[in-house]
């Protein structure tokens, strides 16, 4: 597959930010702000938490989530999984693209029960027009959103 | 805002590295090496710790800081904040762009007094000509800068 | 050095993924999958763990490794070093490009002896044709590969 950058075309890019509505608790992906503040879409679209590709090519996709808590919620596995997943009309299930597992709860100290940790993912993947990328965090209860600078999701064509 | 890549133009990019002089202790941003070793500026300029934009557009900006210590100094909040901030002539205060909070001190164990942690930030933001981006770490004493490969700051236009 | 993007040229990019054969235990760099699944090479080549540059320029290079364990193997220093290194015909030794140190073993908690951590590196470096970039992890025994989404290595020209 040959992908060319035309000098007269805009390069697709997006940066979506965390918001109060990002955590649904429904088992679905995280939702994102697309317009306010630092958020934007350029040559990509958005639908229910997903970045939707309009132009096929190789994209550097990335996400950061801010994790935090007081100790660890009872019943919460000590592993937090943060991942970028692809949805394609060609398969019924989401496909793992980039994934991290962390054990942040162990970061609480004797002098501070509150802990913070951050997970960053980034990598180049090929995406066809109409394919979607979403962010999932398990367990999402530990994601801290605040102001859109600590948890985010983006992509640009390379 | 339409941003085009002209085929005859160089794409702005920079990678700045940590140096002995990076920590000022003055409450200001981290300072960086711009020329020696792996550091370079191409289509961006530098001033007092800041990458200065000469050409408006969307930029992927990134920073990594290496954190390390023995235990945690008293009076140091257990939270380390690492962030990329924008300075613009249109506002008197810096604007948060990308931020992470970590609790690295809890990583020391009985079998290991010394702990190490790393914080990576990266994301796409829109920057106007003349706007500046800086890196701040609170508490900066725990940042390891010395050799330029462990703490760094960069950007490129997308 | 002026590097231009010609509109008729493909932009070099690659994303290599972890595989069962990645960990050699030989003291060499990690090895990678180059074709199956999410892995690809476009305008870059591969040789014995290394991304080999065919076109000189500035590249954003990145790597993520998934770390995990039960406690810490006896005799293992609590520090894990994850780095991207350059091989060039002009020097006999590898050159550090981007490096992180982590102390992940301290993440095990009283309620969970198993810990997980992730290390991400990314930054822009200049690479000449024929130069190579490799990933090293010390101690590689703690790298968890599984399915190619948790540990990976890539680059693209900026």
């Amino acid at each position: 597959l040959i992908q060319e950058r035309r000098s007269h075309e805009v390069n697709p890019a997006a940066h979506l930010t965390g918001a109060n509505s990002s955590l649904t608790g429904s088992g679905g992906p995280l939702l994102w702000e697309t317009q306010l503040g630092l958020a934007f879409l350029r040559g990509l679209s958005y639908h229910d938490g997903a970045l939707v590709v309009t132009k096929a090519g190789y994209y550097y996709i990335y996400s950061k989530v801010q994790l935090g808590g007081v100790g660890c919620p009872l019943g919460l596995a000590s592993t937090i999984t943060h991942g970028l997943y692809k949805r394609t009309p060609r398969y019924p299930e989401e496909l793992e693209l980039l994934v991290s597992q962390q054990s942040p709860c162990g970061r609480a100290t004797s002098s501070s029960r509150v802990w913070w940790d951050s997970s960053f993912l980034g990598g180049v993947v090929h995406l066809e027009a109409g394919e979607e990328v979403v962010v999932r965090v398990l367990d999402e209860r530990l994601v801290r959103l605040r102001d859109g600078t600590r948890s985010y999701f983006g992509a640009f064509m390379v | 805002l339409i941003q085009e890549r002209r085929s005859h133009e160089v794409n702005p990019a920079a990678h700045l590295t940590g140096a002995n002089s990076s920590l000022t202790g003055s409450g200001g941003p981290l300072l960086w090496e711009t020329q020696l070793g792996l550091a370079f500026l191409r289509g961006l300029s530098y001033h007092d710790g800041a990458l200065v934009v000469t050409k408006a557009g969307y930029y992927y900006i990134y920073s990594k800081v290496q954190l390390g210590g023995v235990g945690c100094p008293l009076g140091l909040a257990s939270t380390i904040t690492h962030g990329l901030y924008k300075r613009t002539p249109r506002y008197p205060e810096e604007l948060e762009l990308l931020v992470s909070q970590q609790s690295p001190c809890g990583r020391a164990t009985s079998s290991s007094r010394v702990w190490w942690d790393s914080s990576f930030l990266g994301g796409v933001v829109h920057l106007e000509a003349g706007e500046e981006v800086v890196v701040r770490v609170l508490d900066e004493r725990l940042v390891r800068l010395r050799d330029g490969t462990r703490s760094y700051f960069g950007a490129f236009m997308v | 050095l002026i590097q231009e993007r010609r509109s008729h040229e493909v932009n070099p990019a690659a994303h290599l993924t972890g595989a069962n054969s990645s960990l050699t235990g030989s003291g060499g760099p990690l090895l990678w999958e180059t074709q199956l699944g999410l892995a690809f090479l476009r305008g870059l080549s591969y040789h014995d763990g290394a991304l080999v540059v065919t076109k000189a320029g500035y590249y954003y290079i990145y790597s993520k490794v998934q770390l995990g364990g039960v406690g810490c193997p006896l005799g293992l220093a609590s520090t894990i070093t994850h780095g991207l290194y350059k091989r060039t015909p002009r020097y006999p030794e590898e050159l550090e490009l981007l490096v992180s140190q982590q102390s992940p073993c301290g993440r095990a908690t009283s309620s969970s002896r198993v810990w997980w951590d992730s290390s991400f590196l990314g930054g822009v470096v200049h690479l000449e044709a024929g130069e190579e970039v490799v990933v090293r992890v010390l101690d590689e025994r703690l790298v968890r590969l599984r399915d190619g989404t948790r540990s990976y290595f890539g680059a693209f020209m900026v």
Partner: antibody
């Protein structure tokens, strides 16, 4: 200037007790781990104990565990070593040392002049 | 406990000589190693920390290297004040331990 001054050494009988003090000046005492190290006559250096800057986490060498107690008073810029059940083999010069643990800077960079403890009947 | 073994235990050299002292740890300590110099009747002085970082004010003739289990202190050109006892010390793991020392004497 940055300085550590030990005091409290002397001659004591086996089974006796002594309390060593270390007065710090010229730096923010509460920012640093503090250590006690000793050196028996004609011998090498032996680490005894340390105390963290942040939460008074303490570790001891096996040779003194249960007999010696390290403590600090950040308000007074002082470090202490309470030594009980002293033995002849505890005879040594006792040093206090400041230890850095910040990103780029590690190691016991400031030592006191030492105070001599002699345990003899 | 981690044992640090220094070699040689003593050596004779002249002013201007290049001297190398080795320190081997019984297990991996990463780069958490320091080197000290102690002259008779004086307190130990920090020379190198983090295996290879030169302490402020210490002459550049002192060079530390190594990581993991094998470390080296090199004095490129011995000066009169360098005739002393040198100790390595690991600060990675409790209990903290010192090497047995290397005595550098005048030939």
């Amino acid at each position: 200037q940055v300085q550590l001054v030990e005091s409290g050494g002397g001659l004591v009988k086996p089974g006796g007790s002594l309390r060593l003090s270390c007065a710090a000046s010229g730096f923010t005492f509460s920012d640093y781990y503090m250590n006690w190290i000793r050196q028996a006559p004609g011998k090498g250096l032996e680490w005894i104990a340390d105390i963290s800057s942040r939460d008074n986490t303490i570790y001891y060498a096996d040779s003194v565990k249960g007999r010696f107690t390290i403590s600090r008073d950040n308000a007074k810029n002082s470090l202490y070593l309470q030594m009980n059940s002293l033995r002849a083999e505890d005879t040594a010069v006792y040093y206090c040392a400041r230890e850095r643990g910040f990103g780029d800077y590690f190691g016991m960079d400031v030592w006191g002049q030492g105070t001599t403890v002699t345990v003899s009947s | 406990a981690i044992q640090l073994t220094q070699s040689p235990s003593s050596l004779s050299a002249s002013v201007g000589d290049r001297v190398t002292i080795a320190c081997r740890a019984s297990q991996d300590i990463s780069s958490a190693l320091a080197w000290f110099r102690q002259t008779p009747g004086k307190t130990p002085k920090l020379l190198i920390y983090d295996a290879s970082s030169l302490e402020s004010g210490v002459p550049s003739r002192f060079l530390g290297s190594g990581s993991g289990t094998d470390f080296t202190l090199t004095i490129s050109s011995l000066q009169p004040e360098d005739f002393a006892i040198y100790y390595c010390q690991q600060f990675n793991t409790y209990p903290l331990t010192f090497g047995g020392g290397t005595k550098v004497e005048i030939k």
